[in-house]
């Protein structure tokens, strides 16, 4: 959970078992420019474990659009463009926070939700299981 | 921003220029099990573009701990374990939402913030700039 330092000058909390519900300012402070990941870099195409980006849209969620990576090959791409099946492309996944409208369709009430997204792919050596 | 469907049965909004500030329930609905990324897979070690994971902690942020990937090499690791400098290890970055306490140290008041994190690394063919 969140450790709760106390401070006068903070907005009041009515809930004794605080913090269950908090106030969140949606004027996002952006520490970097937000871009469509396809535009921000072409790694998805130049990688030895290339991936496609799929648009996942959900109006009941913020952000409503999340880009999901899907590896293009089970193997990895060699310098000659062919697939090397002795190596494996795997998705790099990350857990992210999103806001889910709760109750549904409500404009000003949300619940935090953790979802797992695939951000891109990397090329790994397979775990070799020796056959007896 | 967030499209605002109207619905009776929703908590009230006092702000005319809504939604600036919304109520967020912090009882996280977890769509997957949350794990330390080091434990969840060993891709960071088996990748041809291996990375180290650095713990970034900030008590004024939720989540307070974020793991940042840093590529180990400029090049990519070959089958023989040597680094191939004709290829490049690059970080795969993703913009994520975090909650930033605002005012500082306040337990029940936050602002949404977007930050860019490196999730892992991938091996890419370098862009070749031809010299005239």
């Amino acid at each position: 959970g969140i450790a709760i330092p106390r401070n006068s000058g903070c907005p009041n909390s009515e809930d004794k078992n605080f913090p269950r519900t908090v106030m969140v300012n949606l004027n996002i402070h952006n520490r970097n420019t937000s871009t469509n990941p396809k535009r921000s870099s072409d790694y998805y195409n130049r990688s030895t474990s290339p991936w496609n980006l799929h648009r996942n849209e959900d109006p009941e969620r913020y952000p409503s659009v999340i880009w999901e990576a899907k590896c293009r090959h089970l193997g990895c791409v060699k310098a000659d463009g062919n697939v090397d099946y002795h190596m494996n492309s795997v998705p790099i996944q990350q857990e992210i926070l999103v806001l889910r409208r709760e109750p549904r369709h409500c404009p000003n009430s949300f619940r935090l939700e953790k979802i797992l997204v695939s951000v891109g792919c990397t090329c790994v050596t397979p775990i070799v299981h020796h056959v007896a | 921003g967030i499209a605002i469907p109207r619905n009776s049965g929703c908590p009230n909004s006092e702000d005319k220029n809504f939604p600036r500030t919304v109520m967020v329930n912090l009882n996280i609905h977890n769509r997957n099990t949350s794990t330390n990324p080091k434990r969840s897979s060993d891709y960071y070690n088996r990748s041809t573009s291996p990375w180290n994971l650095h713990r970034n902690e900030d008590p004024e942020r939720y989540p307070s701990v974020i793991w940042e990937a840093k590529c180990r090499h400029l090049g990519c690791v070959k089958a023989d374990g040597n680094v191939d400098y004709h290829m490049n290890s690059v970080p795969i970055q993703q913009e994520i939402l975090v909650l930033r306490r605002e005012p500082r140290h306040c337990p029940n008041s936050f602002r949404l913030e977007k930050i860019l994190v490196s999730v892992g690394c991938t091996c890419v063919t370098p862009i070749v700039h031809h010299v005239a």
């Epitope: 496609n52 899907k70 590896c71 293009r72 090959h73 089970l74 193997g75 463009g81 099946y85 494996n88 492309s89 795997v90 998705p91 790994v124 397979p126 775990i127 070799v128 299981h129 056959v131 | 891709y43 088996r46």
Partner: antibody, heavy 120, light 111 residues
């Protein structure tokens, strides 16, 4: 429903080339890989290669590299396989088959096949 | 290439009997993503192959539940619980985790 339409038969002379076609319908052509598979009479199935219609990326079985060339025409949702320097060994049924990507990487729908006969 | 070995070559059965076909691969078919890419097809005379089972044990849409797949690593089995006339034909296993290859086929026929 998903359909992959192939001509029934082709008769060609040794030493020449042939272009086999596969017209897709009933799904989004660019969302699935297209594979080509060879089957000789009484023998097993041999994978020739695959093409991603969205960007025409190709990947070949090393055995068929230089022999087969895969292309697509997105406007007509048609995949093609060009086969060169034909010999009697190339006489076979050639199937096109689609597959999903990555987690869904298996041929789920197949064309009826084109019987290629190489004979003088 | 990964060699896929099917046994038996021919399987005579009576209608209503259980049938079992084995497929062994020369390499492990488990991918680093946790999936095992072993699939089963049925080819009836004069037709193209039809997908029955994908990734070891998942029935493709429209495939009757009398078909089931199992196995792991390098050893896999296709079972038909009660053989019907429409099940006759040649069964192929295939793998797609390496350069895709197919087994030699098992002919299911009436005893």
């Amino acid at each position: 429903q998903v359909q992959l339409q192939q001509p029934g038969a082709e008769l060609v002379m040794p030493g020449t080339s042939v272009r086999l076609s596969c017209k897709a319908s009933g799904y989004t052509f660019t969302s699935y890989w297209m594979h080509w598979v060879k089957q000789r009479p009484g023998q097993g199935l041999e994978w020739i290669g695959e093409i991603d219609p969205s960007d025409t990326y190709t990947n070949y079985n090393p055995k068929f590299k230089g022999k087969a060339t895969l292309t697509v025409d997105k406007s007509s949702s048609t995949a093609y396989m060009q086969f060169t320097s034909l010999t009697s060994e190339d006489s076979a049924v050639y199937y096109c088959a689609r597959s999903g990507i990555y987690y869904d990487y298996y041929e789920d729908y197949w064309g009826q096949g084109t019987t290629l006969t190489v004979s003088s | 290439d990964v060699v896929m070995t099917q046994t038996p070559l021919s399987l005579p059965v009576s209608l209503g009997d259980q049938a079992s076909i084995s497929c062994r691969s020369s390499q492990i078919l488990l991918h680093s993503n946790g999936n095992t890419y072993l699939h089963w097809y049925l080819q009836k005379p004069g037709q193209s192959p039809k997908l029955l089972i994908y990734k070891v044990s998942n029935r493709f849409s429209g495939v009757p539940d009398r078909f089931s797949g199992s196995g792991s690593g390098t050893d896999f089995t296709l079972k038909i619980s009660r053989v019907e006339a429409e099940d006759l034909g040649v069964y192929f296993c295939s793998q797609s985790v390496h350069v895709p290859t197919f087994g030699g086929g098992t002919k299911l026929e009436i005893k």
